[in-house]
Interface confidence: low
C-alpha cells in the first residue's frame, strides 16, 4: 500500500513543472507529460489568475528541460511563454492542469444497500474430545448506534483439509459467533483450515457484500486409523459412468493396495473397476479416480461401491526357483598335486542336472582375481600345478542345469584353505 | 496422472518378494517393507495352499535384502523359511501380503442423490455491438436414454476482470445454453475471462454436485473512455466508516491526480477524503482506498460520493523564481589590455541587486576550465595581462541577488572572441 | 386484508397547494418503499415520487421537483405527498403503490399492492 | 433517463387468440427490474409480472414474460374476456411505457 495524502503533488506534470520570470515581462514555464499518458489524455496546463479566473496556457514541445529531471523513460517536454505586464514582491502564480475532457465518476450511495459488515475477528479453535468449536468476535461499533445489528448478520464458515482447494471447501452457516464441526464434518487425523466471514442475513433491512474473510486457523481433527483409504466419493454423470475417487496415505499405499469394488445391486456379484488413476494429492496422500460403467441407470440405481485390499498375488513356480544348499567343499593331496572335492545335498530328485562354479586364488588375490571353472554334474576337479610355500583358497556353488528346470546360484561353500609344500633347493 | 490396471504389482513388498526353495525341503523368501509403512500398517506374507487355503508366514527381520533391491530409503528387509516335503515340476506358489486389520470403505451411492452433471464444452463468445453472447454445449449421452434431461440442468456462468480474483467474480444464471452479457455487466475497455459450470437445477429430482468448471474463455469489453476512472464502489461498515474503492490506468494516474469527494446529503458542502491509499492492480491499473466518515448513519442514509480530477495547484512566488534575460556582452581594449563589458535589459524595479558571474578562457580550453568571477552590480570588468597572439573566449550571466528575491541565472550570454596582438621581439 | 386507501384530492387553482394522504392496513408498513403514481385523464401512468422504509430514500420525477414533497409517518401507518405550486398539468388521479418486498434491494418485486386512487383538478 | 416503448398502441383481438405485447426500453435494463400491469376502466393498476418473468401472487398461467437487455415481451396465451384492458411496463420504481390496449376485435 502506499499513501498519499489529498494535496500531496504526485502527477509527472506538477512534479516536473518549474517557472521562472524575467521580473519584467514574460514568465516560462517547463513541465512534462508522457507518451504512454497520451494516448488516453492530454492535460493542459491551467494558470490561475484569481479566485474565479482560469486561465489555459499555450504550450509548445520542446527539446529539452534543464530546469527538472523527468521521472519516467517516455517524457515529452513542453515550453510555455505567459506575458506579464506587472510584478510584485508579493506576487503568487498558482498552477494546476486539467484534463482534455471531463473525467470522473459518480455513486449515490444508499447506505442501507451498501453494505459490508466488519469481518470476523480472534477466530479461535478449541475442542472437546472429538468436536471442535469455532469461536470469533465482531464489532459493530458503540451499542447504542444499533444502526447495524447482531439480527442483520449472519456468519459463513468455511472449511477444508490443507490440501484441498478453498474451492471445493464446506460451508456452515451461523447466526451466532461460533460454530460446532464433529466427526459427521471431519475426516480423522487430518489438518483442518477453516476462515469466516459475516454476511447480511436474508432477513434484514440492509444489502450489500460479505465482509473479507478473517484470518485462517488450522487444527488436527479427531485422531483415527491413518492407515483406512478416506473420502470415498462417486458421482453419475447421468449417462453411463460413475466417476469414484478416494485418498490413501502415501506410505500405505505403498505397502497396500486398494482396489475399488462395485456391486450394480446387493445380490448382484462384485467387479473390481480398472483403470484405476492416480495423483498426488499434498505430501502426504495420493488419490485414486476409476469409472464404473453404468449401462443401465434406469434399472440398477443404487451401486454398493467399496475400496478393499486388493489380493495382489505373486505367482512363484517351484521348478525354476531352485536355490540349492551351499556344497560341502574338501581338498585332498594326491601325491605331487591337489584335487578339489565337494559334496551337494541329496536331492530327492536323482535326474536334475548340477552345474557347479569353483573359484580358487592365492591368499594374497581377491575373489575378484581368483581363477574360475564351470564343471557339469562333476563333484571332484584336479587343481593344476601350484606355486610352493603358497596359501591358497577354494570355494564351489552350484545351480540346477536342467531344461525346466532353473532358480539362480547357491550361496557359496565354506571356503577351504591349505598350504602348498616348499620345493628342496637342487644342491 | 499415473495410470495402473487392476491387477497391476504395485506395492513394495510385492515388488521386492523373490522366493527360492532347494527342491527338497523348503522354500525361503525376500521381501522388505518401509519404516514409513510400518508406523501405520503391518502386512503379513501370505501364502495360499490351495483355493480356500490362505498361510500366514512367519518372517524374520533381515539384514540384507541379495535378491531384489529396494526403491525406498528406509526398506526393512524380511527373511522367512516355509518347510516343503515335496516338490513337482508343475508347482506353482501364491503369495500376497495382508494388512493386520481390515482396511476399506463402504458406499451405497443411489445415482439420483449422487448427480454430477457434464461440464460445458465449446464454450464460445461471440459479439454484436456492445452485447457479448457466451455459448456452450453440454453432452446429455444418448437422446433415448432421458435419464438426464435439460430441464434437470441450470448453468452458472462466472465472468470476471482478467486482473481481479475468482473469488470476486459475477455470477450469472442460465437455464439455456447461451448467457448475454452486456453494459451493465461489462466495464468498458477491459478484458473479461468467463468459465461455466453445469449444475442441477433446484426444480431436478436429482441432487449431487456442480460440474467442474469449463476451460475459460477471454475477450475485450465494448471499448469506452480508457482515461475513465472505473469501478467506483463504496461500502459502509455499518458503524462509522464508508470504505470506497476506484480504479485508475496507470498511465493516467500519472499525468491525472483524481481524488474521492463526497457530500453527506444532496445540499450538503462537497468534502474530499483523505487519505488515498494506492495499490497496483495487474500491470495497467492502480486502485485507490479512501474511507469516507459516517458520523450519523441514521440521519444521513444517502452519500454523494464521486472521484474527480484535484485541482492540484503549484504556487509560484514571482520574486523567488527569477531568470534575468542573459546580458548583452562586448570585449573593449584599453591601451595593452582588455575588458569586458555587458548590459543587462532594463527591469522596471531599479532596487534589484544583481550578480555576475563571468568566464573567459583560451580557445584551446574548455568553459569547464575557464576563470570564473563573481561580481555584484558591477557592468564590466578589466581582464589581467593576457598571453599574446593567442585567441580567447568571454561569457557573463545574470541572478537577482537582494533577499527577498530570489531565482536561478540567465542563460549565458552569446559568447565573444578576441585575437590579443603579437608581442614584438626584444632585439 | 392489505389494503391502501387515499385521501385529500379536490379542486384547487393553479399555483394552489394540496396534502394527499395514505392509509395502509393488513400489513407492517415500515418493512415497505411505497411510491406516489399518477394518471392523467386519458393517459398513461406517471411515477411521481418514492420514498424508502425508514424515510431516509427519497426520490421524485423531474416534472414534480422541488414542488412536490413525500413523507410518511410509520407510527400511523401513513404516507403523505405535499403539493404546492400545482399547475394544470398536474391534474390527475393519483395512486399511492407498495412495492413489493424483498431483503436485496437489487431486486424488484413490482408494486404489488395499489390503493383506489384520489382525483386532483387544477383549474382556474 | 431511460425509456420504455411499448407496442403495438392497440391491439384487436378475438378471446381464445394469443396476445403479444413489446416493451421496449431506450438502453439496457436488468430484468431484474422489469414488471407489467394490467389496468381496466374505472381502476387501479394491477401487478401481472415481476423480474421480467416471475408471476405476482394470484395471476393465472396464461400470462407470462419474458426477455432481457432492451426488449421484453408479455405474452397471454389464451386471451379471456376479462383480460382485456390496458398492459404497461414499468422499469424498476420509476419509468412505466406508455400502454398497449388489447381490445376486443
Known amino acids: 500500500w502506499e499513501r498519499s495524502l489529498a494535496g500531496a503533488e504526485e502527477t509527472i506534470p506538477l512534479q516536473t513543472l518549474r517557472c521562472y520570470n524575467d521580473y519584467t515581462s514574460h514568465i516560462t514555464c517547463r513541465w512534462a507529460d508522457t507518451q504512454d499518458a497520451q494516448r488516453l489524455v492530454n492535460v493542459t496546463l491551467i494558470r490561475r489568475v484569481n479566485e474565479d479566473l482560469l486561465e489555459p496556457v499555450s504550450c509548445d514541445l520542446s527539446d529539452d528541460m534543464p530546469w527538472s529531471a523527468c521521472p519516467h523513460p517516455r517524457c515529452v517536454p513542453r515550453r510555455c511563454v505567459i506575458p506579464c505586464q506587472s510584478f510584485v514582491v508579493t506576487d503568487v502564480d498558482y498552477f494546476s492542469f486539467q484534463p482534455d475532457r471531463p473525467l470522473g465518476t459518480r455513486l449515490t450511495v444508499t447506505l442501507t444497500q451498501h453494505v459490508q459488515p466488519p469481518e470476523p475477528r480472534d477466530l479461535q479453535i478449541s475442542t472437546d474430545q472429538d468436536h471442535f468449536l469455532l469461536t470469533w468476535s465482531v464489532a459493530l461499533g458503540s451499542p447504542q448506534s444499533h444502526w447495524l445489528s447482531p439480527g442483520d448478520l449472519e456468519f459463513e464458515v468455511v472449511y477444508k483439509r490443507l490440501q484441498d482447494s478453498w474451492e471445493d471447501a464446506a460451508i456452515l452457516l451461523s447466526n451466532t459467533s461460533q460454530a460446532t464441526l464433529g466427526p459427521e464434518h471431519l475426516m480423522p487425523s487430518s489438518t483442518y483450515v477453516a476462515r469466516v466471514r459475516t454476511r447480511l442475513a436474508p432477513g434484514s433491512r440492509l444489502s450489500g457484500r460479505p465482509s473479507k474473510w478473517s484470518p485462517e486457523v488450522c487444527w488436527d481433527s479427531q485422531p483415527g486409523d491413518e492407515a483406512q483409504p478416506q473420502n470415498l466419493e462417486c458421482f453419475f454423470d447421468g449417462a453411463a459412468v460413475l466417476s469414484c475417487s478416494w485418498e490413501v496415505r502415501k506410505e500405505v499405499a505403498s505397502s497396500v493396495s486398494f482396489g475399488l469394488f462395485y456391486k450394480p445391486s446387493p445380490d448382484a456379484g462384485e467387479e473390481e473397476c480398472s483403470p484405476v488413476l492416480r495423483e498426488g494429492l499434498g505430501s502426504l496422500h495420493t488419490r485414486h479416480h476409476c469409472q464404473i460403467p453404468v449401462p443401465d441407470p434406469a434399472t440398477h440405481g443404487q451401486y454398493i461401491v467399496s475400496v478393499q485390499p486388493r489380493r495382489a498375488e505373486k505367482h512363484i513356480k517351484s521348478s525354476v526357483n531352485i536355490q540349492m544348499a551351499p556344497p560341502s567343499l574338501n581338498v585332498t593331496k594326491d601325491g605331487d598335486s591337489y584335487s578339489l572335492r565337494w559334496e551337494t545335498m541329496k536331492m530327492r530328485y536323482e535326474h536334475i542336472d548340477h552345474t557347479f562354479e569353483i573359484q580358487y586364488r592365492k591368499d594374497t588375490a581377491t575373489w575378484k582375481d581368483s581363477k574360475t571353472e564351470t564343471l557339469q554334474n562333476a563333484h571332484s576337479m584336479a587343481l593344476p600345478a601350484l606355486e610352493p610355500s603358497t596359501r591358497y583358497w577354494a570355494r564351489v556353488r552350484v545351480r540346477t542345469s536342467r531344461t525346466g528346470y532353473n532358480g539362480i546360484w547357491s550361496e557359496w561353500s565354506e571356503a577351504r584353505s591349505w598350504d602348498t609344500e616348499s620345493v628342496l633347493p637342487m644342491w | 496422472w499415473e495410470r495402473s490396471l487392476a491387477g497391476a504389482e504395485e506395492t513394495i513388498p510385492l515388488q521386492t518378494l523373490r522366493c527360492y526353495n532347494d527342491y527338497t525341503s523348503h522354500i525361503t523368501c525376500r521381501w522388505a517393507d518401509t519404516q514409513d509403512a510400518q508406523r501405520l500398517v503391518n502386512v503379513t506374507l501370505i501364502r495360499r495352499v490351495n483355493e480356500d487355503l490362505l498361510e500366514p508366514v512367519s518372517c524374520d527381520l533381515s539384514d540384507d535384502m541379495p535378491w531384489s533391491a529396494c526403491p525406498h530409503p528406509r526398506c526393512v528387509p524380511r527373511r522367512c523359511v516355509i518347510p516343503c516335503q515335496s516338490f513337482v515340476v508343475t508347482d506353482v506358489d501364491y503369495f500376497s501380503f495382508q494388512p493386520d486389520r481390515p482396511l476399506g470403505t463402504r458406499l451405497t451411492v443411489t445415482l439420483t442423490q449422487h448427480v454430477q452433471p457434464p461440464e460445458p464444452r465449446d464454450l464460445q463468445i461471440s459479439t454484436d455491438q456492445d452485447h457479448f453472447l457466451l455459448t456452450w454445449s453440454v453432452a446429455l449421452g444418448s437422446p433415448q436414454s432421458h435419464w438426464l434431461s435439460p430441464g434437470d440442468l441450470e448453468f452458472e456462468v462466472v465472468y470476471k476482470r482478467l486482473q481481479d480474483s475468482w473469488e470476486d467474480a459475477a455470477i450469472l444464471l442460465s437455464n439455456t445454453s447461451q448467457a448475454t452479457l452486456g453494459p451493465e455487466h461489462l466495464m468498458p475497455s477491459s478484458t473479461y475471462v468467463a468459465r461455466v459450470r453445469t449444475r442441477l437445477a433446484p426444480g431436478s429430482r436429482l441432487s449431487g454436485r456442480p460440474s467442474k468448471w469449463s476451460p475459460e474463455v477471454c475477450w475485450d469489453s465494448q471499448p469506452g473512455d480508457e482515461a475513465q476512472p472505473q469501478n467506483l464502489e463504496c461500502f459502509f461498515d455499518g458503524a462509522a466508516v464508508l470504505s470506497c474503492s476506484w480504479e485508475v490506468r496507470k498511465e493516467v494516474a500519472s499525468s491525472v491526480s483524481f481524488g474521492l469527494f463526497y457530500k453527506p446529503s444532496p445540499d450538503a458542502g462537497e468534502e474530499e477524503c483523505s487519505p488515498v491509499l494506492r495499490e497496483g492492480l495487474g500491470s495497467l491499473h492502480t486502485r485507490h482506498h479512501c474511507q469516507i466518515p459516517v458520523p450519523d448513519p441514521a440521519t444521513h442514509g444517502q452519500y454523494i460520493v464521486s472521484v474527480q480530477p484535484r485541482r492540484a495547484e503549484k504556487h509560484i512566488k514571482s520574486s523567488v523564481n527569477i531568470q534575468m534575460a542573459p546580458p548583452s556582452l562586448n570585449v573593449t581594449k584599453d591601451g595593452d589590455s582588455y575588458s569586458l563589458r555587458w548590459e543587462t535589459m532594463k527591469m522596471r524595479y531599479e532596487h534589484i541587486d544583481h550578480t555576475f558571474e563571468i568566464q573567459y578562457r583560451k580557445d584551446t580550453a574548455t568553459w569547464k576550465d575557464s576563470k570564473t568571477e563573481t561580481l555584484q552590480n558591477a557592468h564590466s570588468m578589466a581582464l589581467p595581462a593576457l598571453e599574446p597572439s593567442t585567441r580567447y573566449w568571454a561569457r557573463v550571466r545574470v541572478r537577482t541577488s537582494r533577499t527577498g528575491y530570489n531565482g536561478i541565472w540567465s542563460e549565458w550570454s552569446e559568447a565573444r572572441s578576441w585575437d590579443t596582438e603579437s608581442v614584438l621581439p626584444m632585439w | 386484508q392489505v389494503q391502501l386507501v387515499e385521501s385529500g384530492g379536490g379542486l384547487v387553482k393553479p399555483g394552489g397547494s394540496l396534502r394527499l394522504s395514505c392509509a395502509a392496513s393488513?400489513?407492517?408498513?415500515?418493512?415497505?418503499?411505497m411510491s406516489w403514481i399518477r394518471q392523467a385523464p386519458g393517459k398513461g401512468l406517471e411515477w411521481v415520487s418514492f420514498?424508502?422504509?425508514?424515510?431516509?430514500?427519497?426520490y421524485y420525477a423531474d416534472s414534480v421537483k422541488g414542488r412536490f414533497t413525500i413523507s410518511r409517518d410509520n407510527a400511523k401507518n401513513s404516507l403523505y405527498l405535499q403539493m404546492n405550486s400545482l399547475r394544470a398539468e398536474d391534474t390527475a388521479v393519483y395512486y399511492c403503490a407498495r412495492r413489493g418486498y424483498s431483503g436485496y434491494d437489487y431486486y424488484y418485486y413490482g408494486l404489488d399492492v395499489w390503493g383506489q386512487g384520489t382525483t386532483v383538478t387544477v383549474s382556474s | 433517463e431511460i425509456v420504455l416503448t411499448q407496442s403495438p398502441g392497440t391491439l384487436s383481438l378475438s378471446p381464445g387468440e394469443r396476445a403479444t405485447l413489446s416493451c421496449r426500453a431506450s438502453?439496457?435494463?436488468?430484468?431484474?427490474?422489469l414488471a407489467w400491469y394490467q389496468q381496466k376502466p374505472g381502476q387501479a393498476p394491477r401487478l401481472l409480472i415481476y423480474g421480467a418473468s416471475s408471476r405476482a401472487t394470484g395471476i393465472p398461467d396464461r400470462f407470462s414474460g419474458s426477455g432481457s437487455g432492451t426488449d421484453f415481451t408479455l405474452t397471454i396465451s389464451r386471451l379471456e374476456p376479462e383480460d382485456f384492458a390496458v398492459y404497461y411496463c414499468q422499469q424498476y420504481g420509476s419509468t412505466f411505457g406508455g400502454g398497449t390496449k388489447v381490445e376486443i376485435k
Open positions: 420514498i424508502s422504509s425508514s424515510g431516509i430514500i427519497i
Open positions: 393488513g400489513f407492517t408498513f415500515s418493512d415497505y418503499y
Open positions: 438502453q439496457s435494463v436488468s430484468s431484474s427490474y
